[in-house]
Amino acid sequence: SEVEYIAEVGQNAYLPCSYTPAPPGNLVPVCWGKGACPVFDCSNVVLRTDNRDVNDRTSGRYWLKGDFHKGDVSLTIENVTLADSGVYCCRIQIPGIMNDEKHNVKLVVIKPAKVTPAPTLQRDLTSAFPRMLTTGEHGPAETQTPGSLPDVNLTQIFTLTNELRDSGATIRTA
């Protein structure tokens, strides 16, 4: 099943996707669409690139903020709403016969927590959530530590997220 990423309403969501251009600089078409990857292309395309640049965006909220020319085609959705929830497809159209790379990721948008932050949680976010967090500006902040989501409630998650001081924070759950 898809990897899940959680973002709060009004924040930026970051959905990672990348490939290694071979040779470097030899870019390939990529599409992002809402809905699982179909047999060709993307359904409900939100952003599309060609061999040179982004050439189609259905909204100004969709951005490739990574180093697109090095194959970082991670999608940033700015100012997310509940309607942005769902499965997204990143399709990398590697030239050749049935060479496409397809990546399905699930975005879960939740309402902001209306709770008092817990003052005791001052730990580093990546150690609190091994393999679970991505940030909109810095890409995946992952360790190789196996395991499931730590036994922490959403209030604590939001507290830790706020400590990032990064409006693009997206929490990833396996």
């Epitope: 390939v28 078409p29 669409g33 809905g35 699982a36 179909p38 047999v39 060709f40 292309d41 993307c42 359904s43 060609d50 061999n51 159209q93 590697i94 030239p95 050749g96 016969i97 049935m98 060479n99 496409d100």
Partner: antibody
Framework: EVQLLESGGGLVQPGGSLRLSCAAS????????MSWVRQAPGKGLEWVSA????????YYADSVKGRFTISRDNSKNTLYLQMNSLRAEDTAVYYC??????????WGQGTLVTVSS | EIVLTQSPATLSLSPGERATLSCRAS??????LAWYQQKPGQAPRLLIY???NRATGIPARFSGSGSGTDFTLTISSLEPEDFAVYYC?????????FGQGTKVEIK
């Protein structure tokens, strides 16, 4: 109005070759994947091949892989299917279809390919 | 590859009656399921895509439903021009596959 017009069908001997063309109009051709689908006489539909809008990515059914080659010329708004090593079982009406992602939303009227000695 | 099984093979009905056609997939197709109508000597015509969305120009008497592996095409009240062969098609996984078709004939 979307229009797709196939041509190039005909009678060919087993082992022979044929090249089908599909002229497209009424939409931005280079923005869409295109497919070939065939239908043997009195039978159902069988997807044959597809190509991405840019032409870089291609897809084939196992039954034609290595024998058929799909291509496109976006400057001419034309889709092609080069068919080599034809067999009797390739006899069918061949349709080209616009394939935005999963459904085939517009079809041509088809061209008949008959493989017989 | 994903196998699509349509039932029944033939449906004998009168104009004005309701037609219910079934399509079952051997595994989930992520709701990328389409329905086509084909009349003798003509190309197939897209009726329904993504399981439940009517294609441009398709009358409201045609509706699609279902998800995952089980899908249904319903024609609420058959018109004389609706008697034809209907195919389902999945586009969730390569290769594209079609069902074997259901013929809706006049009773």
């Amino acid at each position: 109005e979307v229009q797709l017009l196939e041509s190039g069908g005909g009678l060919v001997q087993p082992g022979g070759s044929l090249r089908l063309s599909c002229a497209a109009s009424g939409f931005t051709f280079s923005s869409y994947a295109m497919s070939w689908v065939r239908q043997a006489p009195g039978k159902g539909l069988e997807w044959v091949s597809a190509i991405s809008g840019s032409g870089g990515s291609t897809y084939y059914a196992d039954s034609v892989k290595g024998r058929f080659t799909i291509s496109r010329d976006n400057s001419k708004n034309t889709l092609y299917l080069q068919m080599n090593s034809l067999r009797a079982e390739d006899t069918a009406v061949y349709y080209c279809a616009k394939s935005p992602y999963a459904p085939l939303d517009y079809w041509g009227q088809g061209t008949l390919v008959t493989v017989s000695s | 590859e994903i196998v699509l099984t349509q039932s029944p093979a033939t449906l004998s009905l009168s104009p004005g009656e309701r037609a219910t056609l079934s399509c079952r997939a051997s595994q989930s197709v992520n709701d990328y399921l389409a329905w086509y109508q084909q009349k003798p000597g003509q190309a197939p015509r897209l009726l329904i895509y993504d399981a439940s969305n009517r294609a441009t120009g398709i009358p409201a008497r045609f509706s699609g439903s279902g998800s995952g592996t089980d899908f249904t095409l319903t024609i609420s009240s058959l018109e004389p021009e609706d008697f034809a062969v209907y195919y389902c098609q999945q586009g969730g996984h390569a290769p594209i596959t079609f069902g074997q078709g259901t013929k809706v004939e006049i009773k």
